[in-house]
């Protein structure tokens, strides 16, 4: 009966050698793809000279296979019933799933110019930077290949900086041959309701990026949740990509390859301003760009990115306040394409299908002392790209799941 199934499930979702969960956890059996759409700037000169609205045109998808590498340094700790690991990063370009090649060119914001002018606000340093920007023939915008933009390029302006700085720039640099973690998660041996919940990340229970409860590392990594998921639950998870914990709420019942799953979505409330959602007060880190914490839908993660003015949002500024998207033309947000969801099999708590969508933006501000930013009359949160990371349980795995889990219950 149900008790026997519960007992079997509890046993099989423990993260230790020999369980179904462990095997799929160490190396995901699902093919995970990350699609990129790049925002190609159509009017760079007008923006730089007249502070016009930025006209963007998205180009994509450019698809990479990701998360194909097994977890590394997997170490069980019997004393506190945890397992620690590193999640290695790797990306393989998939030409057949892409609209072009990694050599395709895009006009995008000059990442180094925007970042350096933000990090070094001292006017004298900005004047030094200005002379180097001019000397390197850099500008507010640049033309870069997809490969350069994502994985890194040697910046000509930063290469002239006479004190030690990283001269290689890229939105995901460094990526290949790096790893995320160390994660230490509960293995569920002593308490199945804690399975996969993160105990520490990089040796800490807090991130040191935010104030108060915003700084907490909550829940799992979203690949799985403790078993016996209820529709009424708020599922907490931590995403290192956005440097914060976030949550998902039940939206609908979905049938995935014959398996009944619960679709959990990231609600607009999670992106709301503290005016609408007081819990979000500690995600508002400054008063000027956020218009005294009234703007919403963008997250300033500069503290997590060595001071670089990176802002995370949903694609096309979905769920963002009008003032954020007002200076950008060419955006068309819609929930179906641009929201994040998790399809969770409720008995095991496994995420059998997901679509993680986010947009990477960079803040650029007027600068009195930097010529190429001198004519700007306002701040811009400039969209660089958005991504859609998806994974769906394979047919073979789905059959196995149906026969071993859902079939037995029904």
């Amino acid at each position: 009966g149900d008790l026997l199934i519960q007992k079997t499930i509890k046993k099989q979702v423990v993260l230790e050698e020999g369980t179904i969960a462990f095997k799929n956890w160490v190396k995901t059996g699902t093919e995970v793809y990350r699609q990129f759409w790049i925002f190609d700037v159509q009017n760079p000169q007008e923006v730089m000279m007249n502070s016009s609205n930025i006209q963007v045109k998205q180009r994509g998808p450019y698809t990479y296979r990701v998360r194909f590498l097994a977890k590394e340094n997997v170490t069980q700790d019997a004393e506190d019933n945890t397992v620690s690991f590193l999640q290695p990063n790797g990306a393989i370009f998939e030409p057949s799933l892409s609209v072009g090649t990694e050599a395709d060119n895009f006009t995008v914001l000059n990442l180094a110019v925007a970042a350096a002018s933000h990090i070094y606000q001292n006017q004298f340093v900005q004047m030094i930077l200005n002379s180097l920007i001019n000397k390197s023939k850099s500008s507010m915008f640049q033309v870069r290949t997809l490969r350069e933009l994502l994985w890194g390029y040697r910046d000509p302006f930063l290469s002239l900086v006479p004190y030690p700085v990283t001269t290689t720039v890229g939105l995901f640099y460094p990526y290949n041959n790096t790893a995320d973690g160390v994660y230490k998660v509960f293995n569920g041996k002593d308490n199945i309701s804690k399975v996969a919940i993160i105990d520490t990340y990089k040796g800490k229970r807090n991130l040191s990026y935010w104030e108060s409860h915003c700084d907490m590392i909550n829940g799992t990594d979203a690949a799985s949740f403790p078993p016996f998921v209820e529709k009424s639950q708020v599922l907490q998870f931590f995403s290192s990509d956005i440097c914060r914990s976030i949550y998902a709420v039940f939206e609908s019942d979905v049938n995935l390859k014959g398996i009944p799953v619960y679709r959990f979505v990231l609600p607009s409330k999670a992106f709301a301003s503290p005016v609408e959602n007081p819990d979000n007060y500690c995600f508002c880190t400054e008063k000027i760009i956020s218009k005294n914490c009234t703007s919403y839908g963008v997250l300033d993660i500069s503290k997590c990115k060595e001071g670089r003015p990176v802002y995370i949002s949903l694609p096309h500024f979905l769920y963002a306040s009008p003032d954020v998207s007002e200076p950008i033309d060419g955006l068309n947000p819609n929930e179906e394409e641009h929201r994040t969801y998790l399809d969770i099999e409720p008995i095991t708590g496994f995420t059998l299908q997901f679509a993680k969508r986010l947009q990477v933006n960079l803040l650029v501000k007027p600068s009195e002392k930097i010529q190429v930013l001198k004519n700007l009359k306002r701040n811009y949160i400039v969209p660089i790209l958005w991504l859609n990371e998806t994974g769906t349980i394979g047919d073979e795995k789905a059959n196995m799941f149906r026969s071993q889990v859902t079939g037995k219950i029904n």
Epitope: Y120, N122, Q123, F124, V125, M127, I128, N130, S131, P162, Y163, E368
Partner: antibody, heavy 118, light 107 residues
């Protein structure tokens, strides 16, 4: 109160070097640029260069490249300027001056008189 | 390098008179001009910073105007304590450059 205290007058021989100090107090030393300015007797002011203590970024007036070297000691909140291969042309009062946010040369030291004479 | 041409080199004015000093730059510097006063045996003192901004504590008889390449510094009603050398400084680009100075004397 922000104060810039410079070292005393120097009498040096041609060809020698001299190192002038500018000790600061009353502010966060690393956050503000320290500049050095030359004033020859009865003449105008000339910007020698500046240093941002936070990251050591320096910029020199081309005219003083090879003549002046700017350094800082963060632990003692002191800025230094070394002048080398001195000639009579280098005889002048040298000032250190500090910025305040977006204001140039908001605070000045009292000046150091350097006399180059055989 | 932006050169700054300051005029006149010297000026002799009576108390209560209006004093005008001019600086012309070789390049367009927007409003990035600063004005300093120096009394004998003292370091210069900042009176007016970029954007024609009068510094706190500086009497309102001092003012400046100008944009681009042409800048004017004015003392509305000269007092005896205003006897000093006056310098303009462009801070639009490096190297920072000063005008040659104006010696203001009492008539």
């Amino acid at each position: 109160e922000v104060q810039l205290q410079q070292s005393g007058p120097e009498l040096v021989k041609p060809g020698a070097s001299v190192k002038i100090s500018c000790e600061t107090s009353g502010h966060t030393f690393t956050e503000y640029t320290m500049h050095w300015v030359k004033q020859s007797h009865g003449k105008s002011l000339e910007w020698i260069g500046g240093i941002y203590p936070n990251n050591g970024a320096t910029k020199y007036n081309q005219k003083f490249k090879g003549k002046a070297t700017l350094t800082v000691d963060k632990s003692s909140s002191t800025a230094y300027m070394e002048l080398r291969s001195l000639t009579s042309e280098d005889s002048a009062v040298y000032y250190c001056a500090r910025d305040r946010y977006d204001v140039w040369f908001a605070y000045w030291g009292q000046g150091t008189l350097v006399t180059v004479s055989a | 390098e932006t050169t700054v041409t300051q005029s006149p080199a010297s000026l002799s004015m009576a108390i209560g008179e209006k004093v005008t000093i001019r600086c012309i730059t070789s390049t367009d510097i927007d409003d990035d001009m600063n004005w300093y006063q120096q009394k004998p045996g003292e370091p210069p003192k900042l009176l007016i910073s970029e954007g024609n901004t009068l510094r706190p504590g500086v009497p309102s008889r001092f003012s400046s105007s100008g944009y681009g390449t042409d800048f004017i510094f004015t003392i509305e009603n000269m007092l005896s304590e205003d006897v000093a050398d006056y310098y303009c400084l462009q801070s639009d680009n490096l190297p920072l450059t000063f005008g040659a100075g104006t010696k203001l004397e009492l008539k």
